[in-house]
Amino acid sequence: EPPTACREKQYLINSQCCSLCQPGQKLVSDCTEFTETECLPCGESEFLDTWNRETHCHQHKYCDPNLGLRVQQKGTSETDTICTCEEGWHCTSEACESCVLHRSCSPGFGVKQIATGVSDTICEPCPVGFFSNVSSAFEKCHPWTSCETKDLVVQQAGTNKTDVVCGPQDRLR
């Protein structure tokens, strides 16, 4: 009765458990009773990242500069190229196949988390006591000016988009 299963680094073919090819190599010919599996290294710009029985290696990913992409990590015969986005841009997906410009936080909102090559800017509404009067991908909400510490009084209340306006205290005549 021929085998129905093989060990993890083997595969079943023609009632034989043959050795899989190591990462970075592709299958040329299956083993027989008397000959080992024949494997060949992947070519330049190709890779295979697992023990395998593939007859063709995969092409390395191309980081297309026209899509805002650049190489973060060069591929090897065992690993794919890793792309990331140019400064000011981030990936649209986990696979990082294209990039979009980082979002700016509108006035009234501040940056909670600055964007990275793989994640967009995260904005948050400025809470009471804080404001943002610019559209920015970096600026956090700023605290209102403390008039008291300057021996001044609030002449105009602050909002989430504007700072308070301080003025001199009324002098008693």
Partner: antibody, heavy 127, light 107 residues
């Protein structure tokens, strides 16, 4: 220290059941394929069963197929052998053994061997 | 199933002797063969894997050779601690099988 320790052996009547355990320590148990091998008194080694690292693939010697079940709990570093419908000819010392794949990138295709063995647990099937 | 036949079944030799044990497979198994040493009351110990590769920590007086169907284990100069039973095992396919063993005894 890399270790395997079997337990659960004992005297059982023909037709009875027994569950053997093998506790692994000193290595990442969930990364290794495992085996049960037995040895009847005064006899040679007989491979009994195999289980892949995830537990997805199992295989058995014809002599125990349909009666024995191998399983594993990687979270507890334990290997099991459930033995049902036991017969007198199942009387043996049962060893658990680690399968290892030896590989050196210059020496394809690599090779398997059983590099770590427990001390064994005795199973006696008798009326 | 693949059958492994070891010869001889038993062997008497002296310290310093060169000893060869053979293992023949009923079908080609390439180099998917391991050799083990077992002493009474102890579990087997891996000596050779892949027909000819020496396991770490095993003395260099042990060597393995062969491919396909015919394999040999050689001990170049027997030491007192080498007297034991030796088994070959094929790991080519399931069911994995062992040879019947060769008992090496002191003369």
């Amino acid at each position: 220290e890399v270790q395997l320790l079997e337990s659960g052996g004992g005297l059982v009547r023909p037709g009875g059941s027994l569950r053997l355990s093998c506790a692994a320590s000193g290595f990442t148990f969930g990364s290794y394929e495992m085996n049960w091998v037995r040895q009847a008194p005064g006899k040679g080694l007989e491979w009994v069963s195999y289980i892949s690292s995830s537990g997805e693939t199992t295989d058995y010697a014809d002599s125990v197929k349909g009666r024995f079940t191998v399983s594993r709990d990687n979270s507890k570093n334990l290997l099991y052998l459930q033995m049902n419908s036991l017969r007198a000819e199942d009387t043996a010392v049962y060893y658990c053994a680690r399968d290892v794949f030896f590989f050196d990138s210059s020496g394809f295709p690599g090779a398997y061997g059983m590099d770590v063995w427990g001390q064994g647990t005795m199973v006696t099937v008798s009326s | 199933d693949i059958q492994l036949t070891q010869s001889p079944s038993s062997l008497t030799a002296s310290v310093g002797d060169r000893v060869t044990i053979t293992c023949r497979s009923s079908q080609g198994i390439r180099s998917s063969l391991a050799w083990y040493q077992q002493k009474p009351g102890k579990p087997p110990k891996l000596l050779i894997y892949g027909a000819s590769s020496l396991e770490g920590g095993v003395p260099s007086r042990f060597s393995g050779s062969g491919s396909g169907t015919d394999f040999t284990l050689t001990i170049s100069s027997l030491q007192p601690e080498d007297f034991a039973t030796y088994y070959c095992q094929q790991l080519n396919s399931f069911p994995s099988t062992f040879g019947q063993g060769t008992k090496l005894e002191i003369k």
